[in-house]
């Protein structure tokens, strides 16, 4: 079956947008006006995985780039990275588990839990201009809640 991908942007619960910081890193910061054009547009693919009403498995690629958010162990710690893939083979319905996130909607916020590392979430710092990372705590200082704005292709 073909994989369907929809374009979207993300903002954390403090309204910080996500932008590229170097070739393989995302950072979160407040943007306004014309600067909003800097924000990363994701291509979110609906992929194979365990699904429920509140939890949908997705992969998050960067629009028109062969880069996907993935979760790997680095120095024995689950880590978020941007991974380069062969565009001839991606996206696909059955993505490797490191690329899969459970998009969980709770009230009016979204969380993105790593399928590879349960209870680890895409996170941002309270501070401005800091890297987007994989965090193992919810409800603490770090931010794990997002809103999503779908955009036309």
């Amino acid at each position: 079956a073909p994989v369907r991908s929809l374009n979207c942007t993300l903002r954390d619960s403090q309204q910080k947008s996500l932008v590229m910081s170097g070739p393989y890193e995302l950072k979160a910061l407040h943007l306004q006006g014309q600067d909003m054009e800097q924000q990363v547009v994701f291509s979110m693919s609906f992929v194979q995985g365990e699904e429920s009403n509140d939890k949908i498995p997705v992969a998050l690629g960067l629009k028109e780039k062969n880069l996907y958010l993935s979760c790997v162990l680095k120095d024995d710690k689950p880590t978020l990275q941007l991974e380069s893939v062969d565009p001839k083979n991606y996206p696909k319905k059955k993505m490797e588990k490191r690329f899969v996130f459970n998009k969980i909607e709770i009230n009016n916020k979204l969380e993105f839990e790593s399928a590879q590392f349960p209870n680890w979430y895409i996170s941002t710092s309270q501070a401005e201009n800091m890297p987007v990372f994989l965090g193992g705590t919810k409800g603490g200082q770090d931010i794990t809640d997002f809103t999503m704005q779908f955009v036309s292709s």
């Epitope: 369907r4 949908i56 916020k109 999503m148």
Partner: antibody, heavy 119, light 107 residues
């Protein structure tokens, strides 16, 4: 029985604002994504706004982006469409519609509320 | 944006006739297509989703086929209550656009 009842339509001047409501019953409103679809008199259908079940995701096509906002109150089983900076071309019947989880088809529609933008 | 072209824009037919409506898309949408029926003064109603799956309560005289860029809605034996407007809609990529509609009238 699934029921969607729109209200809030009426006559408004160009540049004005209007807020539409859609009261839902007969299903667990908080578990469904919702949308607004409009139909200009004698014309076809145009999707104008989407909101996910909890309100964490939204979508607006370019024709209304920046002018329309969509929201919901799951405690009140109600969907809203706030329309600002209205133009003559926004004149239409506005339908609220229930959508399935992954942004796909509309399985139930309300009967619509008419919005007329004219001076 | 994916463009949706329905044909014909209108047709006249008699009760008992077999009626076919076509929807073409400007890009490959696989089977991500829906058909709706709208009677005058009423809201649209879901007929078919995923190109060929009948919605609950829809009579079996309605059928859908096609994939990729060309799709067909067929009414095998037109009934008096079938005189209405019919719309296709894709849901492959944003925005999910509708066809311009086909009006099925009584001959």
């Amino acid at each position: 029985e699934v029921q969607l009842v729109e209200s809030g339509g009426g006559l408004v001047q160009p540049g004005g604002s209007l807020r539409l409501s859609c009261a839902a019953s007969g299903f667990d409103f908080s578990r469904y994504d919702m949308s607004w679809v409009r139909q200009a008199p004698g014309k076809g259908l145009e999707w104008v706004a989407y909101i996910s079940s909890g309100g964490g995701s939204t979508y607006f096509p370019d024709t209304v982006k920046g002018r329309f906002t969509i929201s919901r109150d799951n405690a009140k089983n109600t969907l809203y469409l706030q329309m600002n900076s209205l133009r003559a071309e926004d004149t239409a019947m506005y339908y609220c519609a229930r959508q399935n989880k992954k942004l796909t088809w509309f399985d139930y529609w309300g009967q619509g509320t008419l919005v007329t933008v004219s001076s | 944006d994916i463009q949706m072209t329905q044909s014909p824009s209108s047709l006249s037919a008699s009760v008992g006739d077999r009626v076919t409506i076509t929807c073409r898309t400007s890009g490959n949408i696989h089977n991500y297509l829906t058909w709706y029926q709208q009677k005058p003064g009423k809201a649209p109603q879901l007929l078919i989703y995923n190109a060929k799956t009948l919605a609950d309560g829809v009579p079996s005289r309605f059928s859908g086929s096609g994939s990729g860029t060309q799709f067909t809605l067929t009414i095998s034996s037109l009934q008096p209550e079938d005189f209405a407007n019919y719309y296709c809609q894709h849901f492959w990529s944003l925005p999910f656009t509708f066809g311009q509609g086909t009006k099925v009238e009584i001959k």
